[in-house]
């Protein structure tokens, strides 16, 4: 009789554990759903506001010609900055011309003042060549002033109206770039 009661008690305990597990799974699922919903709503809101305003760039991005730029409000190392841009469907800023450089430095002056901002430029450890993240070489007028004597990997950043270089593991703001949406009108 005692054995029977003990068996029933163990079965009940097992059932309780399973229910707790199910509740935990449900809570996790609910949290995940809420998170997905939040991003979905944000995406829809962005899409709708873009469609309504015929805006070629997302909210809080600035436009110049066919590009949209996002100036970060957080610091991170170069590699994390790249990751942050990719999550938004963009890449670290790739400066193609003096005109683009002037626009960026002029905008930064208005927005934030004289801070350091990572761009998508890094120095190859073997050859010492500067390359944009897509593998292309910067034009001669857009090479960083030699400033970093680091033994570590060296990356490019913008400060005031200059392109400079620094150890990629230092913390800086960053600038993301993506293509502006073309108006269908």
């Amino acid at each position: 009789k005692l054995l029977q009661v003990s068996t029933i008690a163990m079965q009940q305990q097992e059932k309780l554990i399973q229910q707790e597990r199910a509740l935990l799974n449900f809570t996790e699922w609910k949290r995940s759903c809420a998170l997905q919903m939040k991003y979905c709503q944000a995406f829809m809101q962005n899409s709708l506001s873009s469609a309504h305003n015929s805006s070629p760039c997302p909210n809080n991005w600035i436009q110049n010609r066919e590009s949209c730029y996002y100036v970060s409000e957080i610091w991170s190392i170069w590699h994390t900055s790249q990751e942050n841009c990719l999550k938004e469907g963009s890449t670290l800023l790739q400066i193609e011309s003096k005109e683009e450089m002037d626009f960026i430095t002029g905008s930064l002056r208005k927005i934030k003042g004289s801070y350091d901002y990572w761009v998508g430029l890094s120095q190859d450890g073997h050859s010492g060549r500067w390359l944009w993240q897509d593998g292309s070489s910067p034009s001669p007028g857009l090479l960083p002033a030699e400033r970093s004597q680091s033994a570590n990997q060296v990356c490019g950043y913008v400060k005031s109206n200059s392109l400079l270089s620094s150890n990629c593991s230092t913390w800086k703001y960053f600038i993301c770039e993506k293509y502006a949406l073309r108006s269908s009108v």
């Epitope: 990719l86 469907g89 963009s90």
Partner: nanobody, 115 residues
Framework: DVQLVESGGGLVQPGGSLRLSCAAS????????MGWYRQAPGKERELVAH???????VYADPVKGRFTISRVDGKNMVTLQMNSLKPEDTAVYYC?????????WGQGTQVTVSS
């Protein structure tokens, strides 16, 4: 959820070539970026190459000029053409997809460069 399926890994001699493919399926309407990371034994996972939804491309310094990432038009699929492979390219290569705060990963495919 998003599922990522990789193919194309294997054993290759130094100087040889391999092509990796990754197909995304599941609840996807738009991925912001797709691409590859790799992890060599005893090392951290590192970005290899990525392509954004609007076609912007990112390569890690060690693979620039040797690897080419491309997107298959009309499909949530990316390929990584790896040329002039070196022993230091030996790693498990993971497909990755990004959509804002969400980060999706494939199971990984082994690439071994050895003579």
């Amino acid at each position: 959820d998003v599922q990522l399926v990789e193919s194309g890994g294997g054993l290759v001699q130094p100087g040889g070539s391999l092509r990796l493919s990754c197909a995304a399926s599941g609840s996807i309407f738009s991925l912001n970026a797709m691409g590859w990371y790799r992890q060599a034994p005893g090392k951290e996972r590192e970005l290899v190459a990525h392509i954004t939804s609007d076609g912007r491309i990112v390569y890690a310094d060690p693979v620039k000029g040797r690897f080419t990432i491309s997107r298959v038009d009309g499909k949530n699929m990316v390929t990584l053409q790896m040329n002039s492979l070196k022993p230091e390219d030996t790693a498990v290569y993971y497909c990755n997809a990004k959509h804002y705060a969400s980060n999706y990963w494939g199971q990984g495919t082994q690439v071994t460069v050895s003579s």
